[in-house]
Amino acid sequence: GLNDIFEAQKIEWHEGSHHHHHHHHGSGSLVPRGSGSLPRWRQQWSGSGTTSRFPETVLARCVKYTEVHPEMRHVDCQSVWDAFKGAFISKYPCNITEEDYQPLVKLGTQTVPCNKTLLWSRIKDLAHQFTQVQRDMFTLEDMLLGYLADDLTWCGEFNTFEINYQSCPDWRKDCSNNPVSVFWKTVSRRFAETACGVVHVMLNGSRSKIFDKNSTFGSVEVHNLQPEKVQALEAWVIHGGREDSRDLCQDPTIKELESIISKRNIRFFCKNIYRPDKFLQCVKNPEDSSCLSGI
């Protein structure tokens, strides 16, 4: 059972590493660790370390996901954890590839019905509040793999079985091919590739770049929507200010998004969501009289 798995992991994480040689790469500083007779060294990265209880959290999230999604109960959560672990454990954390995550991606295969994919950029909380109410639409974090990793950080070390709870590579300061960034690039690419029908994207109208080419949406998802399956991309620009009545669909970055999408033979539509609070309320209670006017 789960408790046996957790107990076995505690042994593996805390005792399994000192049988291995340590090799170091890159320019990060090294810090001593361990209390054995031989000094052991750990790469010091600029980013925060692996989230505490990472193995337990991933495994528990997997079981929770299968509990609330009966259609996914065929998934073996121990195998999912083994595949997740296998993607980054004992590997140099600045040299992770999408290939490393393929066994995990294969185990977490899921399909979203056409017209039900919701992408988002810089507005995760509202997107998740929306799919919590509109239960037939799905963000990446509503899928198994996104749910497992949401808000977590993880990395290992070359040639040891240890998880690094002290520090992990930062995308800007250390390297982009780190375990977390590569994971999200991999699963985001797959999520976009499998989308069909009309795809929706929620964008943050309060940002200076409403559409940012460097975001995961702008750099990965936009380019992996399949024109033969996706008829249209509909952007929902979420307004931040109470009195903001500007048409943010005319923003230059939205025009840039429209251009990219149109060149890929996908139609583009844009809507302003002037009152996100009212928008959510009207999704919950569409029959409310105040919902007949614009949102």
């Epitope: 789960l2 509990e67 009966p70």
Partner: antibody, heavy 120, light 107 residues
Framework: EVQLQQSGPEVGRPGSSVKISCKAS????????MHWVKQSPGQGLEWIGW????????DYAEKFKKKATLTADTSSSTAYIQLSSLASEDTATYFC?????????????WGQGTLVTVSS | DIQMTQSPASLSASLGETVTIECRAS??????LAWYQQKPGNSPQLLIY???SLADGVPSRFSASGSGTQFSLKINSLRSEDVASYFC?????????FGAGTKLELK
């Protein structure tokens, strides 16, 4: 040892609301889904819904969508059910329950139950 | 929703006897079924999960079988502490649903 400790009995007037708590101990609260079950006097059991305390996500049986609201406070490891617009048919014992992850998805752990009486 | 039909609604048996309670699902639920025992004034207690697996601490005189739509719970050598209500529950799909219960009494 896993324990689910529920709040004491409640008496509510018709049309009012009550909020029942279920304090979890002996495990990591966010690692498990919490379910709520209703048992009317001398009657069978009805599943109300679940909450994922980690994300606050919920799902409800159709019958309870307008009646019950499930919430959770991770800082105190406590799950709550609020029952609104109370009517006589809401008089029942309400249980929180969770699976063990090792027993399929049957409810291995139950709170002791909270009796809600609706009376004018 | 999946309907769970439990029978009998009540039964009387003598100490040492073997009793069987049946549960029928309105559609295929594979082995996604639990049995609970509930004594007056107490919470239900899990007896059986996955249709035929005994929960921790449950005496071996309890056994269960079935899959698909037909399930049964058997109590061998009935003891006085087995006097209780028994419920089946499907967890194949939401909403989870319970049988109406079987009240077991001593003759």
């Amino acid at each position: 040892e896993v324990q689910l400790q529920q709040s004491g009995p409640e008496v509510g007037r018709p049309g009012s609301s009550v909020k029942i708590s279920c304090k979890a101990s002996g495990y990591t609260f966010t690692d498990y889904i919490m379910h709520w079950v209703k048992q009317s006097p001398g009657q069978g059991l009805e599943w109300i819904g679940w909450i994922d305390p980690e994300y606050g996500r919920t799902d409800y049986a159709e019958k309870f969508k307008k009646k019950a609201t499930l919430t959770a406070d991770t800082s105190s490891s406590t799950a709550y059910i609020q029952l609104s617009s109370l009517a006589s048919e809401d008089t029942a014992t309400y249980f929180c329950a969770r699976s063990a992850h090792t027993t399929g998805f049957g409810f291995a752990y139950w709170g002791q139950g909270t009796l809600v009486t609706v009376s004018s | 929703d999946i309907q769970m039909t439990q029978s009998p609604a009540s039964l009387s048996a003598s100490l040492g006897e073997t009793v069987t309670i049946e549960c029928r699902a309105s559609e295929d639920i594979y082995s996604n079924l639990a049995w609970y025992q509930q004594k007056p004034g107490n919470s239900p207690q899990l007896l059986i999960y996955d249709a035929n697996s005994l929960a921790d601490g449950v005496p071996s005189r309890f056994s269960a079988s079935g899959s698909g739509t037909q399930f049964s719970l058997k109590i061998n050598s009935l003891r006085s502490e087995d006097v209780a209500s028994y419920f089946c529950q499907q967890y194949n799909n939401y909403p989870y649903t319970f049988g109406a219960g079987t009240k077991l009494e001593l003759k």
